[in-house]
């Protein structure tokens, strides 16, 4: 079965800056990736970025530098310390739409005791939804 992994890391140099990495462990071709925070899209979350293999990338503040790392993984940086910025216990979710598997989504957050510069291991977080 396909799985999605989510890794959240707080940058040592900028305590209000996070790096989010997500990947899809499956054999299908990915048609769209949606990254959200505060929960899954459609369940109280806010879209941070959408990445499409051909149609490009859109990101919304405080997201920066959303990009494909490989054909099946993406990363983005969250910056800033304003009211619309994440805190240490924020949940980040990644949803991968692929063919023929369908949509798979997982969420993750910063480990409770993580030091700046350390990251959560890229665990396949619980699959929240498979459409």
């Amino acid at each position: 079965t396909p799985e999605v992994w989510v890794q959240v890391r707080m940058e040592a140099t900028e305590l209000s800056s996070f790096t989010i990495r997500c990947g899809f462990l499956g054999s299908g071709s990915i048609s769209l990736v949606t990254v959200s925070w505060g929960g899954p899209n459609g369940a109280g979350g806010t879209t941070l970025a959408v990445l499409h293999p051909e149609r490009g990338i859109r990101q919304w503040a405080p997201a920066r530098q959303a990009r494909w790392e490989t054909q099946s993984s993406i990363s983005l940086i969250l910056e800033g310390s304003g009211a619309s910025s994440p805190c240490a216990n924020t949940t980040f979710c990644c949803k991968f739409a692929s063919f023929p598997e369908g949509s798979w989504e997982a969420c993750g957050s910063l480990p409770p005791s993580s030091d700046p510069g350390l990251s959560a291991p890229p665990t396949p977080a619980p699959i929240l939804r498979a459409d």
């Epitope: 505060g38 929960g39 899209n41 459609g42 109280g44 979350g45 806010t46 879209t47 959408v50 499409h52 149609r55 490009g56 859109r58 919304w60 503040a61 920066r64 009211a83 619309s84």
Partner: antibody, heavy 119, light 106 residues
Framework: QVQLQQSGPELVKPGTSVKISCKAS????????INWVKQRPGQGLEWIGW????????YYNEKFKGRATLTVDKSSSTAYMLLSSLTSEDSAVYFC????????????WGQGTTLTVSS | DIQMTQSPSSLSASLGGKVTITCKAS??????IAWFQHKPGKGPRLLIH???TLQSGIPSRFSGSGSGGDYSFSISNLEPEDIATYYC????????FGGGTTLEIK
Amino acid sequence: QVQLQQSGPELVKPGTSVKISCKASGYTFTDYYINWVKQRPGQGLEWIGWIFPGSGNTYYNEKFKGRATLTVDKSSSTAYMLLSSLTSEDSAVYFCARDGGLRGPFDYWGQGTTLTVSS
Amino acid sequence: DIQMTQSPSSLSASLGGKVTITCKASQDINKYIAWFQHKPGKGPRLLIHFTSTLQSGIPSRFSGSGSGGDYSFSISNLEPEDIATYYCLQYDYLYTFGGGTTLEIK
């Protein structure tokens, strides 16, 4: 088809507040950012801020922080902008616009709401 | 904040002719620029996004190009209905509009 229908013109006194509405139809309201844009008479367009209806999360242009408040009512697919402590500088046409994501920014617009602040 | 400098502020051209408008960003905006047509009493209309992608239903007389901080927008074979004000918008980070260009037909 996608439509954004804004409330009618407003004539208000300085120092008061006004709430402008933007009713969305023809798409899933909670999936797309709604932006608000200001246009003063004879001038250009100025971005005020956005709200993501699915979560209510907002982001404001620094210039409008504390003066504009964006909210949504998911049950009626309506976005609102409250402008407070009004002055003559707030007299303008205000537009709501959907951000279409990969389809492009501000792909659908409301028709505009004219606000006149005068004593 | 990213600033957008649009020029010219107004221009006049003949029917059937071609016009070009430029927008200069204060930093690299990674091709995240859109162009809008705005007519009085209406909401603006998205013509082009991501520098050169034509919005659905927009005629190919409209085109865009550029990279880094320098972008241009052109209308060829000008028609009477092209009379409007045109704006660029950067959306690489948040949003900033250019000052606008008012197009008149000679």
